[in-house]
C-alpha cells in the first residue's frame, strides 16, 4: 500500500505564439481545480476508462479575475498535493490523466458551472520511494508543470511497496539477509518467503519466490562467492586488523542513480545504468517507449524503440495530442445554435443555451410563435429568443388584445385634429394643409402640392386614413 502524490507547479500559457485567452473575466470570475486519474500503465485503456489505480480531485484554487488587456498569466493554483492512495502493489509503470477544470462563479442558474480547460496524459515508469519526478505537458496553448512521486505507507517498503517492515527484534542489527528499513532505521524488513534454498545469509527477496544476492555473492541461490578473497573492494586505506582494504567514500556511495538505476564508478566520476524507461545522468528523466504503450484511444505508436528515441502517436479520427489523449476541438465548428455556449466534454458535446432556448443544440425556441396566437388579426413574428405580435390597425399590446388609441402619437401634422375611427384615424386639417396626415401645404393659388385632389374632396376637408 502507498500513496501517489502529485504537485502542480504552474498552469498557464505555453511558449510560442497564440497565447490562450484567459479562462476568467471580470464579468465571469472563475477558479481552477485539478483531477488526476491513474491506471496501471501497460493496460490498453482509453482515456475514458475507469481509473483503476485511483483518482483524486484537488481543492478549488483562489478566485481569479482577468485584468483587461493583460496577457493570461500563470493562473492561481489550489493549495496542497493531490494524493491518490493505492491499496496493492505499486505497478512501476502507470498511465496518468491530469485534467484542469474551470469553475465559473458568475450568476449561474442552479449553481456554478464547470468546464474542462485542458487534459494531459502520459505513461511513465516510476519506482516507489524514489525522488520527485518533474514533468511538463502541453495541451493546446496551455502548459502544465508538475511533479509526482509514489511513496509506500508503513509497514510497506521497496520499489513496489511489497516488502514489509517490522520493529527490530534485537537492538543492534537485523536478522540474516534482512536490512534496516530506510528511512526507518530502527525497523527491519520482515522476512518474505524467498525462493526455496535461497541463502539466508547472502540472499534476499523483494517479491515472494525470488532470490537476489547481496554484494559479493552470486548464483541462483546466492551461494557462490564472486571472489575467493574476503576483501571485496580493493580501494581505500588498509585495515591493520584484517589486512583487508576497507572501502573509503566513493562516487557511488549512497547510489546517486534514481529510479532503480545501478551505479558504476568511472575514473573521474560515476555512471548510471538506467532501467528501461529512464535516462539522464542520474536516471532522473523518465523516457517512454512504444513498448510502454503510450498512445491512448487506439493511437498507433511509431518509433521509440529505445528510451533515447522519441515515439510518435498517430491518432485515429477525433483524437489528437502527443498521446492521442485530447479530442479534436469540435466546438470550433460552432454546433450550438442561437448563441449557445459549446462544451466538448470528450464523451459528448454539450451546449449551454441562452435564455429562451433549449434542446441538445439550443435549437428549440421556447418563446417562439408555436402555440401562440395574436388576437384581433395580429400576426406573430419570431426573433432573438422572443416573439412579438404585429398588430392589426387599432390594436396594440403584447398579444394585440388592447384597443390602441390611434391618436395617442399625435399623427396629424400642422395643427390638424385627430379623430379615432373604427378603421384607423381621421385628421381634420387646419386651413392651408391637406393630406391623410395634413402633411401637404395647399399653395396660395389654390393648387395643391399633390398632383390632383382626389375627386369629391376639397382641400381642407378631413382626410380619412385607411
Amino acid at each position: 500500500a502507498g500513496v501517489f502524490e502529485l504537485q502542480i507547479h504552474s498552469f498557464g500559457p505555453g511558449p510560442g505564439p497564440g497565447a490562450p485567452r484567459s479562462p476568467c473575466s471580470a464579468r465571469l470570475p472563475c477558479r481552477l481545480f485539478f483531477r488526476v486519474c491513474l491506471k496501471p500503465g501497460l493496460s490498453e485503456e482509453a482515456a475514458e476508462s475507469p481509473c483503476a489505480l485511483g483518482a483524486a480531485l484537488s481543492a478549488r484554487g483562489p478566485v481569479y479575475t482577468e485584468q483587461p488587456g493583460a496577457p493570461a498569466p500563470d493562473l492561481p493554483l489550489p493549495d496542497g498535493l493531490l494524493q491518490v492512495p493505492f491499496r496493492d502493489a505499486w505497478p512501476g509503470t502507470f498511465s496518468f490523466i491530469i485534467e484542469t477544470w474551470r469553475e465559473e462563479l458568475g450568476d449561474q442558474i442552479g449553481g456554478p458551472a464547470w468546464s474542462l480547460l485542458a487534459r494531459v496524459a502520459g505513461r511513465r515508469r516510476l519506482a516507489a520511494g524514489g525522488p520527485w519526478a518533474r514533468d511538463i505537458q502541453r495541451a493546446g496553448a496551455w502548459e502544465l508543470r508538475f511533479s509526482y512521486r509514489a511513496r509506500c505507507e508503513p509497514p510497506a517498503v521497496g520499489t513496489a511497496c511489497t516488502r514489509l517492515c517490522r520493529p527490530r527484534s534485537a537492538p543492534s542489527r537485523c536478522g540474516p539477509g534482512l536490512r534496516p528499513c530506510a528511512p526507518l532505521e530502527d525497523e527491519c524488513e520482515a522476512p518474505l518467503v524467498c525462493r526455496a534454498g535461497c541463502s539466508p545469509e547472502h540472499g534476499f527477496c523483494e517479491q515472494p519466490g525470488e532470490c537476489r544476492c547481496l554484494e559479493g555473492w552470486t548464483g541462483p541461490l546466492c551461494t557462490v562467492p564472486v571472489s575467493t578473497s574476503s576483501c571485496l573492494s580493493p580501494r581505500g586505506p588498509s585495515s591493520a586488523t584484517t589486512g583487508c582494504l576497507v572501502p573509503g567514500p566513493g562516487p557511488c556511495d549512497g547510489n546517486p542513480c534514481a529510479n532503480g538505476g545501478s551505479c558504476s564508478e568511472t575514473p573521474r566520476s560515476f555512471e548510471c545504468t538506467c532501467p528501461r524507461g529512464f535516462y539522464g545522468l542520474r536516471c532522473e528523466v523518465s523516457g517512454v517507449t512504444c513498448a510502454d504503450g503510450p498512445c491512448f484511444n487506439g493511437g498507433l505508436c511509431v518509433g521509440g524503440a529505445d528510451p533515447d528515441s522519441a515515439y510518435i502517436c498517430h491518432c485515429p479520427p477525433g483524437f489528437q495530442g502527443s498521446n492521442c489523449e485530447k479530442r479534436v476541438d469540435r466546438c470550433s465548428l460552432q454546433p450550438c445554435r442561437n448563441g449557445g455556449l459549446c462544451l466538448d466534454l470528450g464523451h459528448a458535446l454539450r451546449c449551454r443555451c441562452r435564455a429562451g432556448f433549449a434542446g441538445p443544440r439550443c435549437e428549440h425556441d421556447l418563446d417562439d410563435c408555436a402555440g401562440r396566437a395574436c388576437a384581433n388579426g395580429g400576426t406573430c413574428v419570431e426573433g432573438g429568443g422572443a416573439h412579438r405580435c404585429s398588430c392589426a390597425l387599432g390594436f396594440g399590446g403584447r398579444d394585440c388584445r388592447e384597443r390602441a388609441d390611434p391618436c395617442a402619437a399625435r399623427p396629424c401634422a400642422h395643427g390638424g385634429r385627430c379623430y379615432a375611427h373604427f378603421s384607423g384615424l381621421v385628421c381634420a386639417c387646419a386651413p392651408g394643409y391637406m393630406g391623410a396626415r395634413c402633411e401637404f401645404p395647399v399653395h396660395p393659388d389654390g393648387a395643391s402640392a399633390l398632383p390632383a385632389a382626389p375627386p369629391g374632396l376639397r382641400p381642407g376637408d378631413p382626410q380619412r386614413y385607411l
Partner: nanobody, 120 residues
Framework: EVQLVESGGGEVQPGGSLRLSCAAS????????MGWYREAPGKQRELVAG???????KYAESVKGRFTISRDNAKNTVYLQMSSLRAEDTAVYYC??????????????WGQGTLVTVKP
Amino acid sequence: EVQLVESGGGEVQPGGSLRLSCAASGSIFSINAMGWYREAPGKQRELVAGFTGDGMTKYAESVKGRFTISRDNAKNTVYLQMSSLRAEDTAVYYCAADVFTDRDHVDWYWGQGTLVTVKP
C-alpha cells in the same frame, strides 16, 4: 449509425485546385453542422471550413479567399473547393458532421479522411 464518405483527395501542384466531397448517409433526422478539418503531420487537427449550427459558413483564416465550402441539402453532402493550393495545405482532410438521429438525439461523426498532397 451515420457514415461519412470523403472523396476527391490527391496530389496537386502548388497553385492547383481540388474539390473534396463528403456524403453523409444512414439514420439521419437532420444535419446540424458539417464541415472539414485537416491534420498535417505533427500538427493538431484544425477546422478548415464548415457550416455552423446556425447555418453560417466559417473558414480558417489561412484558407479565406482560396477555399469555398458549399452543400447540397437534398444529398446530405458538403463540398470543399480548394484553389491556389500551397505546400502548407498538405494534410489529411477529415469530414465532420454533427447529426440529429432523431428530434432530441445528436451525435458527432468523423469520416476516415482523404489525403491532399501539394508538391511541385
